[in-house]
Structures are given as C-alpha cells and as structure tokens.
Amino acid sequence: KKEDGESTAPTARPKVLRCKCHHHCPEDSVNNICSTDGYCFTMIEEDDSGTPVVTSGCLGLEGSDFQCRDTPIPHQRRSIECCTERNECNKDLHPTLPPLKDRDFVDGPIHHKHHHHHHHHH
C-alpha cells in the first residue's frame, strides 16, 4: 500500500539530455536536436556501395547499454560511440570503421585498400 501523498501513477522520466541528430531525427526535433533520457550516439557504417555514412541522434535509456556496446555484426562494417557527459556531446564523437578482415576481401580489389584513418580520441 502506498503512503499518503505518494502517487500511484508512474512518473515520466524527464528527457534531460539533448543530442545532435543527423539522418536519425525524430519528427518533433528542432534544429537537428533531439532529447533523451538515455544517451547521445554517433554511428558510422558502410552502405551497400561501400560508402561511409554517419548518423547521430538519441538513444533511450532502455536497451542503450546493449546498443552502445557495438557488438560486431558479421559482414557489416559499422561502429558506434555513445556519450552522456553534456548536451550535444555526440558532435565530438568520431567513430571509425573497423579494419577489414580477410573474409571481407571477397568483393575484389575495391576492398583491398587499407584504411589510413588515425584512431585518436582527443
């Protein structure tokens, strides 16, 4: 039994963190900013042609630990980074594509070049 003065209705968790969103903006976002109770993220992945595409936005608290863990997906090159330390922190994230594995070389010379990307995180 609830104590007097305590609400029985669940209280909505406030959306306290604002994130930059790019290719991943909800309909109610303004000026490419979304709000979340969880994390900001930036993700880079290759599309079907091999072009790197960056998306960024908000992740809800529920399930975000798993999503931010960046579990490798076979035959898909992608990388995600998450942050919560301040509003719009994800504009400073710089995920880079993972290095190619031998089994990714099946598509011919297009995939045989190595990345020269530096993996510094300043």
């Epitope: 930059k20 790019h22 930036t42 880079i44 599309d47 079907d48 042609s49 091999g50 072009t51 790197p52 595409v53 960056v54 960024s56 504009k91 400073d92 994230l93 710089h94 880079t96 594509l97 190619l100 598509d107 011919g108 010379p109 297009i110 995939h111 045989h112 070049k113 190595h114 990345h115 020269h116 990307h117 530096h118 510094h120």
Partner: antibody, heavy 119, light 107 residues
Framework: QIQLVQSGPELKKPGETVKISCKAS????????MNWVKQAPGKGLKWMGW????????AYADDFKGRFAFSLETSASTAYLQINNFKNEDTATYFC????????????WGTGTTVTVSS | SFVMTQTPKFLLVSAGDRVTITCKAS??????VAWYQQKPGQSPKLLIY???NRYTGVPDRFTGSGYGTDFTFTISTVQAEDLAVYFC?????????FGSGTKLEIK
C-alpha cells in the same frame, strides 16, 4: 603517367540528355573508386557521388538522385556520367576524380567537361 | 550533410607572405580533411590529405594541421604561382562536402 581525360564541352537544350566520358590511363580503372564532382559557374565544388569500379555499384548524393547516372565501360577504362532531362541549373563543369578505395579524398582529377544550356 | 565553413573568402597578399586559411567542421571529422588547389581554368589538385599529410610532389611550403572540428592550411612563403582558389573537404562521411573556397590573389 596517371591521367583522367574527359570528353569535350557540350551545349544542350533543356530536356535533352548529355553523356560525359572520363577515360583513365596509367592505372587499372577497377582498383580505384571514381567520383563525380560538379562546379557551377563561379561556385564551389559539390560531390555528386561515386561508382564502385569493381562491382559497378553507384552511389548518389541526395541532390543527384533521379536524373543522374554513373556507368562504366571497363574494357575501355572509361567511366560515364549521364544527365537526363537537362535543366538550367545543370549548367556547370563536371569533373571525374579518382579516390583510393575506402579513402575519400580525390588524388587525381579529370580535365573537366563544361556543359551549358542553350535556350 | 556536414558543413565545412571556410575563411576567409579572399586573400590579397604579397609574394613572400605567410598565408593561413581555416576550415571549421560542423561535427568531429577526426583527421579526415583534405585541401585542394584550383588554379584559374584548371582542375583541382590534391595538396594535403588526412589533415596534415602532403601529397606526392607537393612543395613543403604547403602544410596542413588540425583535428576534430578545426583545421588550418598554411602557405609559409607565398609565390606568384600560388594564385588559385583553395578548398577544404571532409572525407569522413557521405556526402563528402567542400568548403566554399578561398581565392588567393597576389599583389
């Protein structure tokens, strides 16, 4: 000597189709990506997209989806850009530009092809 | 798409001067920025890639630096043949975008 030699200038009426060629020499076409870049008169550079020269799969920037098509004739070491239903705003110089695969800076540029609309 | 804000638009300098051009990215680009030179009536030429790497055959008076969102291109001692428009470009994410250009004119 590595070169990208493009076809000559074109004068087109609105609604017509133009096809620009870019012939690669001094390297194997299929070991580098081929990008296309637009430069409108007195303006900056705009990346239109690229074609994966090994698989033949093209990718287009959002502003160039629909009327624009990239293609290859690998036996002739040549890449093509086709513009359908030519419009006034397509008046520009078009460059092909080579990129090391999985790197996206452009180390060799074509000679450029100027396409102008004639009313 | 990501915006590369390039400044200044114009530079009027004397031969022998030092010149600096800046590009500010709308998002962290890491080292993924290149610089190009386009002389009048010519195609662009790659000068710098990965922010600070000089391309083959580029004179050492041309240098690049920066990381993240702030990038700088410098000509240590301008020569008459450096008359051109200079562009930065982010090569991190599609669509790959260019700065608006800096026109370098020699007095």
């Amino acid at each position: 000597q590595i070169q990208l030699v493009q076809s000559g200038p074109e004068l087109k009426k609105p609604g017509e189709t133009v096809k620009i060629s870019c012939k690669a020499s001094g390297y194997t076409l299929t070991t580098y990506g081929m990008n296309w870049v637009k430069q409108a008169p007195g303006k900056g550079l705009k990346w239109m997209g690229w074609i994966n020269t090994y698989s033949g799969v093209p990718a287009y920037a959002d502003d160039f989806k629909g009327r624009f098509a990239f293609s290859l004739e690998t036996s002739a070491s040549t890449a093509y850009l086709q513009i359908n239903n030519f419009k006034n705003e397509d008046t520009a110089t078009y460059f092909c530009a080579r990129s090391e695969l999985r790197n996206w800076y452009f180390d060799v540029w074509g000679t450029g092809t100027t396409v102008t609309v004639s009313s | 798409s990501f915006v590369m804000t390039q400044t200044p638009k114009f530079l009027l300098v004397s031969a022998g001067d030092r010149v600096t051009i800046t590009c500010k990215a709308s998002q962290n680009m890491g080292h993924n920025v290149a610089w190009y030179q386009q002389k009048p009536g010519q195609s662009p030429k790659l000068l710098i890639y990965y922010a600070s790497n000089r391309y083959t055959g580029v004179p050492d008076r041309f240098t690049g630096s920066g990381y993240g969102t702030d990038f700088t291109f410098t000509i240590s001692t301008v020569q008459a043949e450096d008359l051109a428009v200079y562009f930065c470009q982010q090569d991190y994410s599609s669509p790959f975008t260019f700065g608006s250009g800096t026109k370098l004119e020699i007095k």
